[in-house]
Structure formats: structure tokens, C-alpha cells
């Protein structure tokens, strides 16, 4: 999906009111420095590509993050602010059914988080030069 | 240009109902979203109510479901609130606001439709009064 005709503003507003608090409440209890921030993104449309590669597939070491509060919110924004993005979701959704699996929080899908809580900050700050 | 107003408004004890009133123009009505905010005085801008004006789905804050009942009349563009049972803490500005996609993408809009900033236009408010 090409991500370049959503709306970041509301998708940013949607971030900053309740997913970002959500990616908080999946961390609480780890350090902020406990993770190195390795994942990074260029502009809006490929933060949101990132995203979504790290939200909705499964990685070595953490099956699946699909089912947390924050995914299915991030799911949502998209659907609403990405013009045809529910469109050609529907095949992985289906995937993704198949092979869901019961929810166990690793330190691997911590860090993963952490990397998404990156990305997601890059995301709100799109004229920051890349370091 | 957009505009959203609000009417209905009033003084009233408590116990009493209310009808509040959206009249909008300007954009294309059936593809809306349009919810129900309100203010008190020293408080932050609370969601009450939503509804799509592209399929009829409601939603509502759990402080006024079986008490607050929103409707729309895509006919006259216009979105309305009947307050029952009114209380004093209901007791604030009432503004309507619209959205865009957030109508026709209601299902998803749950996890949304309470949060202001998401909102593009909004009328004056109503100041509704709820006495002891």
C-alpha cells in the first residue's frame, strides 16, 4: 500500500490522543534506554510503511502484536485516513487469521515496540533532518 | 464554507429533558461524522455523543447512554440531542463538530470519535444549564 495520499494530520492527532498512550501502557514496567533505537524512517509516507510492517508482521521471536490495543488502533487510523487501505487489507486479514496465536509478551515484541514508539515519534516530527 | 450551528440550549431543572439542534451546510452531509462535545467551565472539551450520517451508527460517552439519544435528518442536514433526565453535572457548552471520513469508516471510529482534535469544523456552542 502506497501510504503518500493519508491524512497525517489526523492520523497524527489519532497517535498523539490515544495510541501513543497505549504503546506506553504495553511498555510500563521497562526502561526507556533499554532498547537501541535501530528501525528509522525518511518521511510520513514511509514512517507509516514501517509501522506497519512492525505492527502487523510476525517476526522472529514475536508471533504477533495484531491483537494489542494499539495495533487495532493503528489498524483503525489507517482504514479511516488512508484512502483504500481497508481495500487491501482484506486478503492479509484473512492470513492473518489462520495463524493467530495466543497473546505472550516477549522481550522481543518489547523491543519491537520500542522500535515503533521511534518510528511513530519520527512520524510526528516530519521536517527533523535524519541523523 | 462549513458551518455548523447549534440551538436548543437553555435552563433547566434537573430531571428535565432538552432538544439541541446541529443544523450544518457547506459540505456533504450523508459522508459526515457528526458528534456531540461539551465543556464545563475549568474542565477539558468531553465527547458525548456520535453519529454517521452514511449508516446511522451511534456511540456514546457511558456518563449519558440510556439518558442522551442522537438522530439525524439527512434531509434537513440537521443532527439532533434529546437530553432526558437531565443533572446538574450535565451542565456546560454544548458543541457539535464534524468529520470527514470518520462517517463512512464508523465501525473503526470507535476507538476515535470522543477525541476533539480529530475534529475539522465546529459550531458556536449552546449553553445548556442544568439547576438543583
Known amino acids: 500500500y502506497d501510504f503518500t495520499n493519508c491524512d497525517f494530520e489526523k492520523i497524527k492527532a489519532a497517535y498523539l490522543s490515544t495510541i501513543s498512550k497505549d504503546l506506553i501502557t504495553y511498555m510500563s514496567g521497562t526502561k526507556s534506554t533499554e532498547f537501541n533505537n535501530t528501525v528509522s524512517c525518511s518521511n510520513r509516507p514511509h514512517c507509516l510503511t514501517e509501522i506497519q510492517s512492525l505492527t502487523f508482521n510476525p517476526t522472529a521471536g514475536c508471533a504477533s502484536l495484531a491483537k494489542e490495543m494499539f495495533a487495532m488502533k493503528t489498524k483503525a487510523a489507517l482504514a479511516i485516513w488512508c484512502p483504500g487501505y481497508s481495500e487491501t487489507q482484506i486478503n492479509a486479514t484473512q492470513a492473518m487469521k489462520k495463524r493467530r496465536k495466543r497473546k505472550v509478551t516477549t522481550n522481543k515484541c518489547l523491543e519491537q515496540v520500542s522500535q515503533l514508539q521511534g518510528l511513530w515519534r519520527r512520524f510526528n516530527r516530519p521536517l527533523l533532518k535524519q541523523q | 464554507q462549513v458551518q455548523l450551528v447549534e440551538s436548543g440550549g437553555g435552563l433547566v431543572q434537573a430531571g428535565g429533558s432538552l432538544r439541541l439542534s446541529c443544523a450544518a451546510s457547506?459540505?456533504?452531509?450523508?459522508?459526515?461524522?457528526i458528534t456531540w462535545f461539551r465543556q464545563a467551565p475549568g474542565k477539558e472539551r468531553e465527547g458525548v455523543a456520535y453519529?454517521?450520517?452514511?449508516?446511522?451508527?451511534?456511540y456514546y460517552a457511558d456518563s449519558v447512554k440510556g439518558r442522551f439519544t442522537i438522530s439525524s435528518d439527512n434531509a434537513k442536514n440537521t443532527v439532533y440531542l434529546q437530553m432526558d433526565s437531565l443533572k446538574p453535572e450535565d451542565t456546560a457548552v454544548y458543541y457539535c463538530?464534524?468529520?470527514?471520513?470518520?462517517?463512512?469508516?464508523?465501525?473503526?471510529?470507535?476507538?476515535?470519535?470522543?477525541?476533539?482534535?480529530?475534529?475539522?469544523?465546529w459550531g458556536q456552542g449552546t449553553q445548556v444549564t442544568v439547576s438543583s
Open positions: 463538530a464534524a468529520e470527514g471520513r470518520m462517517g463512512t469508516h464508523s465501525r473503526d471510529s470507535v476507538y476515535f470519535w470522543a477525541f476533539s482534535a480529530l475534529y475539522d469544523h
Open positions: 457547506g459540505f456533504t452531509f450523508d459522508d459526515y461524522a
Open positions: 453519529i454517521s450520517n452514511f449508516d446511522g451508527m451511534t
